[in-house]
């Protein structure tokens, strides 16, 4: 029951996280114009991974896509790639995890197969979450670097005149959405991996019970030794079974009132 709950919760948390990563990737507010000490108040600019938007004092808002690929910073391209990889991995993870859910029966799927699928989806969610967190963090670092460069340029330049970027940008809402979503996807992935351990079928332990005809002299050999009649070749208590496979005889058993020898 706890395993099913952990798996189900992991799935739901990851689902919310991936929805958040998709939302963040599509949002236009990755960076917003810093209004502090900016004399230009007629326009407010905010930018996403795909386009830039301007809201004018009249209330009119216009957005334009970044139609050039070569003119864009490599860091922006890297962030785009990380977010897309995160979404793709997350989507595949969701698909796999749906079939892995313990509460859903598909044909005669073994528990071991479900455990493997749960682990696979969990790892995918973890990588997806890490991609999103990395992407957002790279973008945030780019903004911080640009902010301080812009601040420095405000007080330098030819003849004290600003010669470079005067508009400074600060963190937009999409960054926080991305961080939270990436974290949720990561947590969901960890929960799936934990659930996988509980799903894996454990080897059944049977008490070794031997029934023999009363006419023979029977020796009870506990601790993984084959019960012997005393006439066989195993009179020196040698282990019958070698290798990794465990048999019911190999599971240590102690005599109880139900053991008849």
């Amino acid at each position: 029951m706890a395993v099913t709950a952990c798996q189900g919760l992991g799935f739901v948390v990851s689902l919310i996280g991936i929805a958040g990563i998709i939302a963040a990737t599509c949002m236009d507010q990755w960076s917003t114009q810093d209004l502090y000490n900016n004399p230009v108040t007629a326009v407010f600019n905010y930018q996403g991974l795909w386009r830039s938007c301007v809201r004018e004092s009249s209330g009119f808002t216009e957005c334009r896509g970044y139609f050039t690929l070569l003119g864009l910073p490599a860091m922006l391209q890297a962030v785009r790639a990380l977010m897309i990889v995160g979404i793709v991995l997350g989507a595949i993870g969701l698909l796999v995890s749906i079939f892995a859910l313990k509460c859903i029966r598909i044909g005669s799927m073994e528990d071991s197969a479900k455990a493997n699928m749960t682990l696979t989806s969990g790892i995918m969610f973890i990588v997806s979450g890490l991609c999103a967190i990395a992407g957002v963090s790279v973008f945030a670092n780019m903004l911080v670097t640009n902010f301080w460069m812009s601040t420095a340029n405000m007080y330098t330049g030819m003849g004290g005149m600003v010669q470079t970027v005067q508009t400074r940008y600060t963190f937009g809402a999409a960054l926080f959405v991305g961080w939270v979503a990436g974290g949720l996807t990561l947590i969901g992935g960890v929960m799936m991996c934990i659930a996988c351990r509980g799903l894996a079928p454990e080897e059944t332990n049977y008490k070794a019970v031997s029934y023999h005809a009363s006419g023979h002299s029977v020796a009870y050999k506990p601790g993984g030794f084959k019960a012997s009649t005393g006439f066989g070749s195993n009179t020196k208590n040698k282990k019958i079974y070698d290798g990794g496979a465990r048999t019911e005889d190999e599971v240590q058993s102690y005599p109880s009132k139900h053991d008849y020898v």
């Epitope: 960076s31 230009v40 007629a42 326009v43 600019n45 930018q47 830039s52 938007c53 301007v54 004018e56 004092s57 009249s58 009119f60 216009e62 957005c63 334009r64 970044y66 003119g71 864009l72 910073p73 922006l76 780019m142 903004l143 640009n146 600003v162 010669q163 470079t164 970027v165 005067q166 508009t167 940008y169």
Partner: nanobody, 118 residues
Framework: QVQLVESGGGLVQAGGSLRLSCAAS????????MGWWRQAPGSQRELVAI???????QYGDSVKGRFTISRDNAKNTVYLQMASLKPEDTAVYYC????????????WGQGTQVTVSL
């Protein structure tokens, strides 16, 4: 690369008028503003007026009611009509194009001197 060419500066008497123009050549990102800034000797840069690609206009407090900015999007040109000039309007006037592509870009002209005498 965007190039800005300013013209129209010069010497004028107080109360007189001047018209500055600035033509931008090259590829400019669709979202932008074009405008004028000025800097008097020993002073900081000051906003004179800007005109955005969407049609919004903003004036600096010291020139409101006296200066008029206009923009011709087809020619990528911005004009500044200066009237009722005062000696304190004496400064180097810089044309500026700011584009709102990724993290913004600023382009500046070389500046044109405007001197207002009494």
């Amino acid at each position: 690369q965007v190039q800005l060419v300013e013209s129209g500066g010069g010497l004028v008497q107080a109360g007189g008028s001047l018209r500055l123009s600035c033509a931008a050549s090259g590829s400019i990102f669709g979202l932008n503003f074009m405008g004028w800034w000025r800097q008097a000797p020993g002073s900081q840069r000051e906003l004179v007026a800007i005109a955005t690609s969407g049609g919004s206009i903003q004036y600096g407090d010291s020139v409101k009611g006296r200066f008029t900015i206009s923009r011709d999007n087809a020619k990528n040109t911005v004009y500044l009509q200066m009237a009722s000039l005062k000696p304190e309007d004496t400064a180097v006037y810089y044309c500026n194009v700011h584009t709102y592509d990724f993290l913004g870009r600023d382009y500046w002209g070389q500046g044109t001197q405007v001197t207002v005498s009494l």
